[in-house]
């Protein structure tokens, strides 16, 4: 079998074959394609069960998508010498169900990490911080993509999935430099209270396609750099005054609220007033009442206070079964 040496510009990607010799520093691992010119290694859809040990030192972009990795242990990418150039790591759709503490240690340049489409039954609190110290060394991560990482119901741990993800995001305050966080399609019922306070550099936050019913206990106040907040396709019924004021106070933000089942009753009055004067909400004239029945399909922006009533609550003596 011929072994693949470092790729040349004439052959941007070379697939490696098994080699009898010990790996050279810039050799391409078996079942991978490598381009030194592009500083890229692709080990895609190869049913790999572990991270290749013989990754070339030049790798800046590493794609390990569509594999069967199952577990990412501590130091999964630790090498001697370290993979000092690795900046973008894509592990999406690789059947990971466990990411252990310190899995991404010894990657000093890692700016972008994508773990999407892995059913993570266990995500260590120290997956991104690397240590259990109350304040860790800052992570170099700038973009963290965690879309659709919720495991099936039968694989969930006893603790809440929201809590498990939150613990990993806040541990050691390691992610203070994070600019982008994607948490779409994770069946989140709520956003743990303290998460956003620990992510002050966020510019882009995607919480779309979850099951968020309320933002009452979520504070956006310190996200002064936030530019995009995606809340579409949730179960939001109304935004209350505290949330409205916080969003209005963010200097650069654009908020996306499509496809939430807004309840157009007396509790909606403040939100309607705010919508009419804010420039924060994108496509605000698409927001449409879902409930109550008499209000269904009405455009929120066209409502006035007279439309927004609540059925009187009968005193217990007048209630009938």
């Amino acid at each position: 079998t011929s072994s693949a040496s470092s790729s040349s510009s004439s052959a941007p990607f070379l697939a490696s074959a098994a080699s009898a010799q010990p790996p050279l520093p810039d050799q391409c691992p078996a079942l991978c394609e490598c381009s030194e010119a592009a500083r890229t290694v692709k080990c895609v859809n190869r049913n790999l069960t572990e991270v290749p040990t013989d990754l070339p030192l030049y790798v800046r972009n590493l794609f390990l998508t569509g594999n069967q990795l199952a577990v990412l242990p501590a130091g999964a990418f630790a090498r001697r010498p370290p993979l000092a150039e690795l900046a973008a790591l894509n592990l999406s759709g690789s059947r990971l169900d466990e990411v252990r503490g310190g899995a991404f240690e010894h990657l000093p340049s890692l700016r972008q990490l994508d773990l999407s489409h892995n059913p993570l039954a266990y995500l260590s609190p120290f997956a991104f911080s690397g240590s259990n110290a109350s304040i860790s060394a800052p992570s170099p991560l700038v973009e963290l993509i965690l879309n659709h990482i919720v495991p099936p119901d039968d694989k969930r741990q006893n603790r809440s999935f929201e809590g498990m993800v939150a613990a990993a995001l806040v541990a050691g305050r390691a992610l203070q430099g994070l600019h982008l966080l994607e948490l779409a399609s994770n069946h989140f019922l709520y956003l743990p209270r303290d998460v956003l306070a620990q992510l002050p550099s966020l510019r882009y936050l995607d919480l779309s396609n979850n099951s968020l019913v309320s933002l009452t206990y979520v504070s956006f106040r310190n996200l002064t750099h936030l530019e995009s907040l995606h809340l579409e396709d949730n179960a939001l019924k109304v935004l209350h005054n505290g949330t409205l004021a916080e969003l209005q106070g963010l200097p650069h933000v654009r908020v996306f609220l499509d496809n939430n089942p807004w309840v157009c009753d007396c509790h909606m009055a403040d939100m309607v007033t705010w919508l009419k004067q804010t420039g924060v909400v994108q496509g605000k004239d698409r927001l449409t009442c879902a409930f109550p029945e008499k209000m269904r399909n009405r455009v929120l922006l066209e409502l006035n206070s007279a439309d927004l009533d609540c059925d009187p609550i009968l005193p217990p003596s007048l209630q009938t079964s």
Partner: antibody
């Protein structure tokens, strides 16, 4: 009661344009988006686009972007759809429908025939 | 864009028979709406938010499902139920899409 009134038929020549109308009554016209849907003979339903009567904002199905133009006249509570450069493929029934999450009221449809 | 696939395309049922038709989504959707269109008439919203019957729809109709799999059931077929039924995904932003329809005939 909510009603959406559409003319029954329109006959036009290939290459010409036509402006279909939909007159709304029984509700506040500006409070609901108005949608247009195409149905060719013995075929399914195809969403063309919608318009917010309050501000004139529109959305279009990519397949109709270059051919359909949606407008409204608030004073008469009427929505319009202009179709240009007509061919025989455009012969169909065109419905207006009030909607948001779903289409809760439909017009009776205008049968457009494109023939020389 | 979500693609909705209805099956069967055509079916027939005898009076009194139980009827079930399905609507399969290419990716998960929160709810599905169903429309009934009798021959020569405009569609009518029949079932909305997966399982709620529009006012005036007989209680022999029901809807169920979640995720990517939805169905409309008639507990006991009647002649007036002969029509084409279309599903549509729950959304308030473009594009709106319909399934290809299931034509239900009386045997």
């Amino acid at each position: 009661q909510v009603q959406l009134q559409q003319p029954g038929t329109e006959l036009v020549k290939p290459g010409a344009s036509v402006k279909l109308s939909c007159k709304a009554s029984g509700y506040t016209f500006t409070s609901y988006w108005m949608h247009w849907v195409k149905q060719r003979p013995e075929q399914g339903l195809e969403w063309i686009g919608n318009i917010n009567p309050s501000n004139g904002n529109t959305n279009y199905n990519e397949n109709f972007k270059s051919q359909a133009t949606l407008t409204v006249d608030k004073s008469s509570s009427t929505a319009y759809m202009q179709l240009s450069s007509l061919t025989s493929e455009d012969s169909a029934v065109y419905y207006c429908a009030r909607g948001g999450w779903d289409f809760d009221y439909w017009g009776q449809g205008t049968t457009l025939t494109v023939s020389s | 864009q979500v693609v909705l696939t209805q099956s069967p395309a055509i079916m027939s049922a005898s009076p009194g028979e139980k009827v079930t038709m399905t609507c399969s989504a290419s990716s998960s959707v929160r709810y599905i709406h169903w429309y009934q269109q009798r021959s020569g008439t405009s569609p009518k919203r029949w079932i909305y938010d997966t399982s709620k019957l529009t006012s005036g729809v007989p209680v022999r109709f029901s809807g169920s499902g979640s995720g990517t799999s939805y169905s409309l059931t008639i507990s006991s077929m009647e002649a007036e139920d002969a029509a084409t039924y279309y599903c549509q995904q729950w959304t308030s932003k473009p594009p709106w899409t319909f399934g290809g329809g299931t034509k239900l005939e009386i045997r």
